[in-house]
């Protein structure tokens, strides 16, 4: 029978139907349109951007298309009273500042409204002393400093580059070392690609290049000042002392330039070893302080941004489905951007405008998938996932009850080398199927499939023949969905080759030279990119829309359940006498991961044989299905971090980009032979570890027969 | 208590290479820095380079750079000195030292370069 | 390469009696000099950080001082179990380098 009961397509056609119809040429039509001013969160621009895309998505067909908004925390400089670093001399005299604007892009030079750069939600303040060097201000390097070099960081500026992990992670461990106030910068090491010029005539950062973004650790929260609920009309908000996840010191962002000016002068204590030394030509001595004939100067830094409520708008549009209009797939990608947002956001809005686009054809001829598709354009992720969070915040409800997928789609590249997918167990089955059948856009890869060049340049670190699928972390759109709802999520981009690239990122991230240009000369000239990329995502929600069974298989999750089981196991028993002394046992957690893999197994082989014809059985399979991502959160969720409830997947409580398996036990164990108290630290690792096989249990339990 | 014991005395002839180990136990072995130092009979001490044990970031004094390889098996908190290419005046006691201020010391390896 | 010249080569001291221990950088290091104590047929022992710190169970009779490039190293009360060989490090610039050393004998 059909998968797709509600056209008057031939079926087998659909999905090829709606692949064919999406076009690079198109795809590039609407990055140019997105990307000519900023969209700024809470600006006029962004308000105005919002409107076009609600009137082109009816236009393409949907069945509705409205403007959610919240009224939520943003962050702004003060236009008159710029923020800036100085080196001051004894007399209190700068006698050097840092630049106050990025030097515009070929052609944008009388673009109003760039914002300068800037650490979103920094705190006003004007600290001045000594700097110290923190490399990338991650929780080992503060170990580092702290531990074996015996640096106090308390009272002191501390400068960290960009890179590794999330910013905001940064800061919140300088806060943590009692620093007084924290410069961010970009080192060649990693926003400097060997043999690439710089923008304009390459894809590298120039040295007035400055990366911005939010320095907030919300941990899931959403509006700082609405935690758990929506920013709306007749919102209760806390005050700003009681908001969560500001930072408490001045923070603020500076390119190489910039940094070369104060790293030159660094004294004290030479750097450890060569993993704290960047491509500056300076020593990346750590301090404290300056060397020799400058040691009487400071560091000053003069920051005066401001924190305001401002409305911020989502464009949710809908597309009805024919048989099952009360599951919901979602495909959400955000719309504001630093700057012009080349690359993030416009890149993934693009394709996103293309997918409704080739969905809205298939409709207009007759068609509707089996189950109903929303697309969301988010605001204000930028500053914290906002608009995501908030309209997810406000829907929970009918979420929790009717959510099938999430799909994210920010950047569409990162890179131009291979496919990248995090997603949940649950959806590897379809990625690969899919990749096996679109064709892959890499040279030297003509006629073969998406998945064969991307298993070959990206394989699977455990199993051969198999590409790398990683697990989700944070940073971006789905995380409310995943973290929060346990709403099965996935995510696709082109990315760079991690071998031979070892910068952060993509060099020009949230800078001013984050244009269309940037794109369209360097990264994708043709668009075959990001129509892989269109094609992937789109494959992904149209085969979660419309197949009649759920394409999840439950028992991946099985797999991986097992993989994270013997990690975490093997982390343990680095102490064996203490889980000797106090009686640590995994056993309950191996034995829920068995029981697991064997109704996994059972429920696999039921899925294969059940009538589905019959639409109550087909139905109860579905939901079966649906609520197992669901069956994952504990409604307490993680210890201090309320808002991530999913018990397999976590943040990373060092870098909010990157995913943690067992995330409770995890941060159990963490650093461990350092409490305290040890009689207290492994009772609270044996209670995780509780958690963790009652969740798993809990969640088996769900694959069962229900009768 | 923290302990650092390095493997035993070894004799070796010109041209050839010689490998140390320093096995480490009573801390946490990815938190200091391992330096290897040497001491001529009779002579001060020289620094020969050091590694980061939790990423294997190293740096070595150029003056033996090419000839040392400093190395780390993070599962047995073992740290490794390789000198290649030998010569007479490589004669000296080689110890490991943990912390970034040589906070601990192995027991010292004695290495004799001779014909 | 900073080289660090350390002064006296030797110097002989009643029991109970001040010792003072020099040290000087070929240029300036700022605060990053260590101090150590090696007695005949044993490793180094670390004493001072951060050319004043003493390192934990270090006895107070032990003060470092200085900054730039002259520091020193002090002795308040000469005891039997002092008679090694002092040696200053700079960990301010690579290659990180020693002093000669200071031998401290009983008068």
């Known amino acids: 029978k059909s998968s797709n009961e509600a056209t008057n397509i031939t079926p087998k056609h659909n999905m090829k139907a709606f692949l064919d119809e999406l076009k690079a040429e198109n795809i590039k039509k609407f990055l140019y349109n997105f990307t000519q001013i900023p969209h700024l969160a809470g600006t006029e621009q962004n308000f105005q951007l919002a409107k076009q895309i609600q009137s082109q998505w009816k236009e393409f067909g949907l069945d509705s298309v409205e403007l959610a908004h919240y009224d939520v925390l943003l962050s702004y400089p003060n236009k008159t009273h710029p923020n800036y670093i100085s080196i001051i001399n004894e007399d209190g005299n700068e006698i050097f500042n840092t630049s106050l604007f990025e030097p515009p892009p070929p052609g944008y030079e009388n673009v109003s409204d760039i914002v300068p750069p800037f650490s979103a939600f920094s705190p006003q303040g004007m600290p001045e002393g000594d700097l110290v060097y923190v490399n990338y201000a991650r929780t080992e390097d503060f170990f580092k400093l702290e531990r074996d070099m015996k640096i106090n960081c308390s009272g002191k500026i501390v400068i960290a580059r960009y890179g590794k992990v999330f910013r905001g992670n940064k800061v919140k461990n300088a806060q943590l070392a009692g620093a007084k106030g924290v410069i961010l910068y970009s080192d060649p090491a990693d926003y400097f690609a060997p043999g690439v010029k710089s923008y304009p005539d390459g894809w590298n950062l120039p040295g007035g290049g400055v990366q911005r973004g939010n320095i907030l650790n919300l941990n899931g929260a959403g509006d700082p000042l609405t935690p758990g609920y929506p920013a709306n009309e007749y919102a209760y908000r806390r005050g700003i002392a009681e908001a969560v996840g500001l930072p408490s010191i001045p923070v603020h962002p500076i390119g190489y330039y910039d940094a070369q000016k104060l790293l030159e002068k660094m004294g004290g204590s030479a750097p450890p070893d060569s993993s704290w030394r960047g491509s500056l030509k300076v020593p990346y001595n750590v301090g404290p302080g300056f060397t020799g004939n400058f040691s009487t100067q400071k560091v000053k830094m003069h920051i005066h941004s401001t924190n305001e409520v401002t409305r911020i708008y989502n464009v949710i549009g809908t597309l009805r489905g024919a048989v099952e209009p009360d599951r919901y797939v979602i495909l959400g990608g955000h719309r504001d951007s630093w700057v012009f947002g080349g690359i993030d956001p416009q890149s993934g809005a693009a394709v996103v405008h293309e997918i409704v686009r080739s969905f809205g054809t298939l409709k207009k001829e007759g068609w509707r998938p089996r189950r109903t598709i929303l697309f969301a354009s988010w605001d204000a992720e930028e500053f914290g996932l906002l608009g995501s969070t908030e309209w997810a915040e406000e829907n929970s409800r009918l979420l929790q009850e009717r959510g099938v997928a999430y799909i994210n789609a920010d950047s569409s590249i990162e890179g131009n080398y291979t496919l990248r997918v995090d997603c949940t167990p649950l959806m590897y089955s379809l990625v690969h199927n899919l990749t096996k059948e679109l064709k892959s856009p890499d040279e030297g890869f003509e006629g073969k499939s998406l998945y064969e060049s991307w298993t070959k340049k990206s394989p699977s670190p455990e199993f051969s023949g198999m590409p790398r699928i990683s697990k989700l972390g944070s940073g971006n759109d789905f995380e409310v969905f995943f973290q929060r709802l346990g709403i099965a999520s996935g995510r696709a981009r082109y990315t760079k080759n991690w071998e031979t690239n070892k910068f952060s990122g993509y060099p020009l991230y949230h800078s001013v030279y984050e244009t269309y240009e940037l794109v369209e000369k360097f990264y994708d000239p043709m668009f075959k990119y990001h129509l892989t990329v269109a094609q992937v995502r789109g494959g992904m929600v149209f085969e979660l829309a419309n197949s009649i069974v759920l394409p999840f298989d439950c028992r991946d999750y099985a797999v991986v359940l097992r993989k994270y089981a013997d990690k975490i196991y093997s982390i343990s028993m680095k102490h064996p006498q203490e889980m000797k002394t106090y009686s640590v046992s995994f056993d309950s957690l191996f034995s829920a991961v068995k029981n697991f893999t064997e109704i996994a197994s059972k429920f696999s082989e039921r899925l294969q044989d059940f009538d589905k014809s019959n639409p109550i059985v087909l139905r109860m399979m579905n939901d079966q299905l649906m609520f197992l991502e669901r069956a994952f959160i504990d409604p307490l969720g993680l210890p201090d971090r309320p808002f991530y409830r999913h018990v397999i997947y976590a943040p990373s409580s060092h870098n909010k980009y990157a995913g943690e398996s067992f995330p409770g036990i995890y941060d159990a164990l963490f650093d461990i032979e350092s409490k305290v108290d040890p009689s207290k630290a492994w009772g609270e690792v044996k209670r995780q570890i509780y958690v963790a096989a009652f969740t798993v249990q809990a969640a088996a339990e769900t694959l069962s027969e229900v009768a | 208590e923290v302990q650092l014991v390095q493997s035993g005395a070894e004799v070796k002839k010109p041209g050839a290479s010689v490998k140390v180990s320093c096995k480490t136990s009573?801390?946490?072995?990815?938190?200091?820095?391992i330096h290897w130092v040497r001491q001529a009979p009779g002579q001060s001490l020289e620094w020969m380079g050091n590694?980061?044990?939790?990423?294997?970031?190293?740096t070595y004094n150029q003056k033996f750079q090419g000839r040392v390889t400093i190395t780390v098996d993070k599962s047995t908190s073992t740290a490794y000195m390789e000198l290649s290419s030998l010569r007479s005046e490589d004669t000296a006691v080689y110890y490991c030292?943990?912390?970034?201020?040589?906070?601990?010391w192995g027991q010292g390896t004695l290495v004799t370069v001779s014909s | 390469d900073i080289v660090m010249t350390q002064s006296p080569d030797s110097l002989a001291v009643s029991l109970g009696e001040r010792a003072t221990l020099s040290c000087r950088a070929s240029?300036?290091?700022?605060?990053?000099v260590d101090w150590y104590q090696q007695k005949p047929d044993q490793s180094p022992k670390l004493l001072i950080y951060?050319?004043?710190t003493r390192h934990t169970g270090v006895p107070d009779r032990f003060t470092g001082s200085g900054s730039g490039t002259d520091f020193t190293l002090t002795i308040s009360s000469l005891q039997a179990e002092d008679v090694a060989v002092y040696f200053c490090?700079?960990?301010?610039?690579?290659?990180?380098?020693f002093g000669a050393g200071t031998k401290v004998e009983i008068k």
């Open positions: 240029q300036d290091v700022g605060t990053a």
């Open positions: 030292a943990a912390g970034w201020n040589f906070d601990y």
């Open positions: 590694i980061n044990p939790n990423n294997g970031g190293t």
């Open positions: 490090r700079q960990y301010n610039s690579y290659p990180l380098t």
């Open positions: 009573g801390y946490t072995f990815t938190e200091y820095t």
């Open positions: 951060w050319a004043s």
